[in-house]
C-alpha cells in the first residue's frame, strides 16, 4: 500500500504519542485560524417543491423509503428563514459558513438552461449577506441532492454522462457566485454517496448490493470532481483567485493487538479502502490504492495513464470530514475485524503521512444527540472539546497543517437515514413550530467562547 500511514499504528518515534500530560492541551490555535460552521441544503432548507425547485433523489427516497417521515418540508426552513440563520451565525462569530447549493433548486431537472430565478435569488442573497458580515462562504456544489430527473433519465452517478452535466452546473455556479466565493467544495463525502447510495441502499437512491455499481459511482464522482477542478483552474481561478477541493470522509481504526503486524496491516487496509479510495487518485498518485486494484479486479474501474495524470493533484487543500456518518453504521468490509476509534488526531496524522503533509480543512466535525435533547447538549460539548483538543494537539505537537475547522452543524435538521431522530445542530429548532426559532444550545455558547479565545485558555 502506498504512503507511510501505517507508521501511526506502529507508533513511529517521529509521531509524538499522546502521553498523560498531553491528554488535554491548554493552548491557542494559530493566528488567523479559520473557524466555521456548516449545513447541507437538503438538511436545512425545507421548501422541497417551493418556488420552482425540482425534486431531488432524496426527496423521492424520503417518500419511498422513510415511511415515518412526511418530507423535508418541515426541516429548519432555512429557505424561508434566511435572516434567522444569519443571526445564528452572528451569534457564534464564525469566520466562515459552509453551506451547499441545492442543484435542483437552481436547475429543477438538473440540466443547465435558464436557472430557476427564485433559487438563484436565494443563494445570491445569502452570499451577499455573508460578504456584508465578513463571513467567508465555503460553498459545496453537491451534498447528495441529485436532481431526480438525472437519476431517472441516466441512472444518476452510475452513468458517466452526469460528469459533463455536473461540470455545466459547476460552471454556472462559478459564473454567478464566484465573485463572492473563494472556497469551493465539489462533492461532500463521495464515499457515502457510493457506499450507502448503491451498496447498502441506506441513502438515496437506495440501490443495494451491487459492488460494481458502487465502484462505478465512485469512479464517476472522482472524474466529475477532477473535471470541475480543471475547469475552475483554467477558466476561473486566474481572475476569481479561489481554492477548490472535495470533502473526503473517514472513520478511524485501531488494531486489536497493537504490536501485531497483521492487525496493523488490516487497519491500513481499512483506511485505504474508505479514505484512500478517493484520496489516492486526488491527493496521491492519481490512481486507486494498489491493494484495492488487486482485490477488486472484477469491479473497480481502471484509470488510463492520461486519466491518472488528470486526477492527480486536483485539490487545493485536503477537506476532511470526521463525524457520525462515517461511523454508523460502518460497513464490515471497512472494519476488517479491528476496532473503530474517534481519534481525530491520529486520523489527521495518517493523512499527513499518507499524502505528504497537505494543508487540511476540517470540513465537517461533530457528533449527535438524541432528538429529545433540547438546548442542554452536554454530550455535544464533551465531544466538541475532545475533537478540538485533538485538532490542537495535531497542530501544535504533530505539526499538521490544519488551517480551519467546521463545526457541524449550525442547525438541527434532517439527518439522512436517521431523519429527525437525532440532532446535530448547535442551534435547537422545534420542527413542529411555525417560526422555527433558532435557540442556541450549550454547545453554541461553548463554540462561541472557543472562537473568541482562539482555543483553550487555562
Amino acid at each position: 500500500f502506498s504512503g507511510d500511514g501505517r507508521a501511526i499504528w506502529s507508533k513511529n518515534p517521529n509521531f509524538t504519542p499522546v502521553n498523560e500530560s498531553q491528554l488535554f492541551l491548554y493552548d491557542t490555535f494559530p493566528k488567523n485560524f479559520f473557524w466555521g460552521i456548516g449545513t447541507g441544503a437538503l438538511q436545512v432548507e425545507g421548501s422541497w417543491k417551493k418556488d420552482g425547485k425540482g425534486p431531488s433523489i432524496w426527496d423521492h427516497f424520503i417518500h419511498t423509503h422513510l415511511k415515518n417521515v412526511s418530507s423535508t418540508n418541515g426541516s429548519s426552513d432555512s429557505y424561508i428563514f434566511l435572516e434567522k440563520d444569519l443571526s445564528a451565525l452572528d451569534f457564534i462569530g464564525v469566520s466562515f459558513y459552509q453551506f451547499s447549493i441545492s442543484w435542483p433548486r437552481l436547475f429543477p431537472d438538473g440540466i443547465v438552461t435558464v436557472a430557476n430565478a427564485k433559487g438563484l435569488q436565494y443563494y445570491s442573497t445569502l452570499l451577499d449577506a455573508l460578504v456584508l458580515r465578513n463571513i467567508e462562504p465555503i460553498v459545496t456544489l453537491y451534498h447528495w441532492d441529485l436532481p431526480l430527473a438525472l437519476q431517472e433519465k441516466y441512472g444518476g452517478w452510475k452513468n458517466d454522462t452526469i460528469i459533463d452535466i455536473f461540470n455545466d452546473y459547476a460552471t454556472y455556479c462559478f459564473q454567478m457566485f464566484g465573485d463572492r466565493v473563494k472556497y469551493w467544495i465539489t462533492i461532500h463525502n463521495p464515499y457515502l454517496v457510493a457506499w450507502h447510495g448503491y451498496g447498502t441502499g441506506m441513502h438515496a437512491p437506495g440501490e443495494k448490493g451491487n459492488l460494481a455499481a458502487v465502484y462505478t459511482v465512485g469512479h464517476n464522482l472522482i472524474k466529475a470532481h477532477s473535471k470541475v477542478w480543471h475547469n475552475y483552474n483554467t477558466h476561473f481561478r486566474p481572475h476569481q483567485k479561489g481554492w477548490l477541493s472535495i470533502t473526503l470522509g473517514s472513520h478511524w481504526i485501531e488494531p486489536n493487538r497493537s504490536e501485531n503486524t497483521m492487525d496493523i496491516f488490516k487497519c491500513q487496509q481499512s483506511m485505504v479502502s474508505v479514505l484512500g479510495w478517493f484520496a489516492n487518485p486526488i491527493h496521491g498518485d492519481g490512481d486507486y490504492p494498489e491493494g484495492m486494484r488487486k482485490k477488486l479486479f472484477s469491479v473497480l474501474p481502471i484509470f488510463s495513464e492520461a486519466e491518472k495524470h488528470e486526477m492527480r493533484g486536483t485539490a487545493d487543500f485536503f477537506a476532511f470530514s470526521f463525524g457520525p456518518n462515517n461511523f454508523k453504521p460502518l460497513n464490515t468490509m471497512a472494519k476488517m475485524g479491528q476496532n473503530v476509534s474517534l481519534n481525530l488526531r491520529e486520523a489527521l496524522n495518517w493523512i499527513k503521512l499518507e499524502y505528504n503533509n497537505p494543508r487540511i480543512l476540517i470540513a465537517e466535525n461533530g457528533w449527535f444527540t438524541d432528538s429529545r435533547v433540547k438546548t442542554e447538549d452536554t454530550t455535544a460539548i464533551y465531544m466538541m472539546k475532545n475533537f478540538l483538543s485533538q485538532v490542537l494537539q495535531a497542530i501544535r505537537l504533530d505539526e499538521i497543517r490544519v488551517f480551519g475547522y467546521t463545526a457541524w452543524s449550525l442547525l438541527d435538521g434532517f439527518e439522512w437515514q436517521d431523519a429527525y431522530t437525532i440532532r446535530r445542530g448547535l442551534f435547537y429548532v422545534d420542527f413542529n413550530s411555525k417560526q422555527k426559532e433558532r435557540k442556541p444550545k450549550s454547545s453554541a455558547h461553548y463554540y462561541k467562547q472557543i472562537i473568541r479565545e482562539n482555543g483553550f485558555s487555562l
Partner: antibody, heavy 119, light 107 residues
Framework: QVQLVQSGAEVKKPGASVKVSCKAS????????INWVRQATGQGLEWMGW????????GYAQKFQGRVTMTRNTSINTAYMELSSLRSEDTAVYYC????????????WGQGTMVTVSS | DIQMAQSPSSLSASVGDRVTITCQAS??????LNWYQLKPGKAPKLLIY???NLETGVPSRFSGGGSGTDFTFTISSLQPEDIATYYC?????????FGPGTKVDIK
Amino acid sequence: QVQLVQSGAEVKKPGASVKVSCKASGYTFTSYDINWVRQATGQGLEWMGWMNPHSGNTGYAQKFQGRVTMTRNTSINTAYMELSSLRSEDTAVYYCAKYNWNYGAFDFWGQGTMVTVSS
Amino acid sequence: DIQMAQSPSSLSASVGDRVTITCQASQDISIYLNWYQLKPGKAPKLLIYDVSNLETGVPSRFSGGGSGTDFTFTISSLQPEDIATYYCQQYDNLPLTFGPGTKVDIK
C-alpha cells in the same frame, strides 16, 4: 453457514459441452463473485474466470476465452459454468468458489464436479 | 502470466514435526498471496490470505511469511489431519495463478 453445492459428475464425448451448476446458500449470493477453478488429474489448480452474480459481468482466463460461459440465475442463487468443444485434456474436477473482496481470496469452495471427456 | 513454483513437490514428516513449504513467484507480487489446503474428495479450504493473515477458524499452527517473490508456509507441529496438498495462489495480476502444490503426508 456458507455452502456451495455443485451438480454431480458428468461424462461427455469430445466436441460436446458440459454445464456445471453451483448453488449458493448462507450468504447474499449477489454480493460476491463466483470464480471457477479446475484441477485436471494429477495436475495443479487452474483458474478459469469470474462472474459477478449481481450484474452478470464476467472475466475469463485467456486460455478459456471463447469456450467458457459463466452465467447465473439469481432467483435460485445458482451459478453455472459451461465449457464447450470439450477435449480429453478438459477431464478434471471443476470447482466453484466464492471470492472474498477483503481477502483477495476464495474463502468458500464447492465440493467439486468431476467431468470426464472420453470417446 | 505469473508463474508460481513450489518446493518441495511432496514431503513426509512425523507428527509434531515443523514443516515448511516455499513458494516462489516469477515476478514481484508484493503481499498478494494466499494459501489453500486440498484434501481428496473435499472442498479446498482457505488457510492464509495476504501472505500471513490466518483465516478465521484455522489453527494457529499454520503460518505464512515473505514478500515480493519468496514466500513460506509453515505448520509448526504437524497433525494427522494436516495430510493434504497445499497450494499458494497469487492475485497480483490476472490471470490468477496457483503453484503446482506440495503434497504432505505422515511418515
